[in-house]
């Protein structure tokens, strides 16, 4: 029950959890399709433990294999707003380093402006992923509404 | 304190051009989309244009698209509406709009506008 | 295009008076992104109410806002004598964003 109460007492890190769930701060410049995240128990239902934030983009600092997801919802836009202004698509990837750069998940908007999506995939310590929203349509920043995480599922 | 201040509205002949500007102040302007709104005299309000916070996006009313050019200059807090060829149907007062944070395109303050003439 | 119309076009109250003003959609506007507006001869249009049914910022509670769908309802549950105005609904959860032509709320 002591090893029970110590273990309670250890942050999530120590055990190998490393969990970040995020909310949308805000979009790139001109030419720049990233989107730009935050995170922190001061912005509600948002956190980091373990990986962190490196100028709005999420870096992992544990290797294993994680779940990443993902909701956008976008702010301006309709079923046929979506298509006129085709394509609107989300793009999540490891962006750094270069050496290990790969698309992980790419969905099309198409006939919708919400879209979700979540995978498991194995990163490495120092992997920075990149969440790209291609298209001229806005994403909503309400926080039920747009959202980025990870967490870590086994080494 | 929130303020939006237009001007560069006149009167101006059919084929004519004319610029807005908008000056925004009390709030971090890059950070908002931005739109103009326009009232013909007695009329009903309607949308114009619309400029994402970056400006990387623009969205126009198919009554002015391929006439009008919305854009904005962070640096100086100012919305901008390029109007070319005009036409007498464009005679309104013309409101600058700030979108609330989250993009949706409700307005939550607006200027108190600049009256645009389109008049031979 | 989604076309709002409202009604009625004018309604004539005293004050006290419960005012209840009507906007239609000509198709359904996503996720009741609605808004309503008021203003005032002379002014730039004031928002009351944004989501179909949330207040915002400094506006007293006898204004709320209910429906979804293609049907919407601004109500004012005692009018004051600064509420007698133009208010205008608007979509925006479809580009073109459009707005009603406005119900006028006078004087009896």
């Known amino acids: 029950q002591r090893f029970a109460q110590a273990q309670q007492q250890l942050p999530l890190e120590s055990l190998g959890w490393d969990v970040a769930e995020l909310q949308l701060n805000h979009t790139g410049p001109q030419q720049d399709p990233r989107l730009y995240w935050q995170g922190g128990p001061a912005l509600g239902r948002s956190f980091l433990h373990g990986p962190e934030l490196d100028k709005g983009q999420l870096r992992i600092h544990r290797d294993g294999i994680y779940m990443v997801h993902i909701q956008v919802t976008l702010a301006i836009c309709s079923s046929t707003t979506a298509s006129r202004h085709h394509p609107t698509t989300l793009a999540v990837g490891i962006c750094s380093p270069a050496s290990r750069s790969i698309s992980l998940l790419r969905l099309s908007f198409h006939q919708g402006c919400t879209i979700a999506s979540q995978r498991l995939t194995p990163l490495a310590r120092g992997d920075t992923l990149c969440t790209n929203l291609t298209g001229t349509l806005l994403p909503s920043r309400n926080t039920d509404e747009t959202f980025f995480g990870v967490q870590w599922v086994r080494p | 304190e929130v303020q939006l201040l237009e001007s560069g509205g006149g009167l101006v002949q059919p084929g004519g051009s004319l610029r807005l500007s908008c000056a925004a102040s009390?709030?971090?302007?890059?950070?908002?989309?931005m739109s103009w709104v326009r009232q013909a005299p007695g009329k009903c309000l309607e949308w114009v244009s619309t400029?994402?916070?970056?400006?990387?996006?623009?969205f126009y009313a198919e009554s002015v698209k391929g006439r009008f050019t919305i854009s904005r200059d962070n640096s100086k807090n100012t919305l901008y509406l390029q109007m070319n060829r005009l036409r007498a149907e464009d005679t309104a007062v013309y409101y600058c709009?700030?979108?609330?944070?989250?993009?949706?395109?409700?307005?939550?303050?607006w200027g108190q506008g600049t009256l645009v003439t389109v008049s031979s | 295009e989604i076309v709002l119309t409202q009604s009625p076009g004018t309604l004539s109250l005293s004050p006290g008076e419960r005012a209840t003003l009507s906007c239609r959609a000509s198709?359904?506007?996503?996720?009741?992104?609605l808004a309503w507006y008021q203003q005032k001869p002379g002014q730039a249009p004031r928002l009351l109410i944004y989501?179909?049914?949330s207040r915002a910022t400094g506006i007293p509670d006898r204004f709320s806002g209910s429906g979804s769908g293609t049907d919407f309802t601004l109500t004012i549950s005692r009018l004051e004598p600064e509420d007698f105005a133009v208010y205008y609904c608007q979509q925006y959860g479809d580009l073109p964003f459009t707005f009603g032509c406005g119900t006028k709320v006078e004087i009896k």
């Open positions: 009390g709030f971090t302007f890059s950070v908002y989309a």
């Open positions: 198709q359904s506007v996503r996720s009741s992104y």
């Open positions: 989501g179909a049914s």
């Open positions: 709009a700030r979108h609330d944070y989250s993009n949706y395109a409700y307005f939550d303050y």
């Open positions: 400029i994402s916070g970056s400006g990387g996006s623009t």
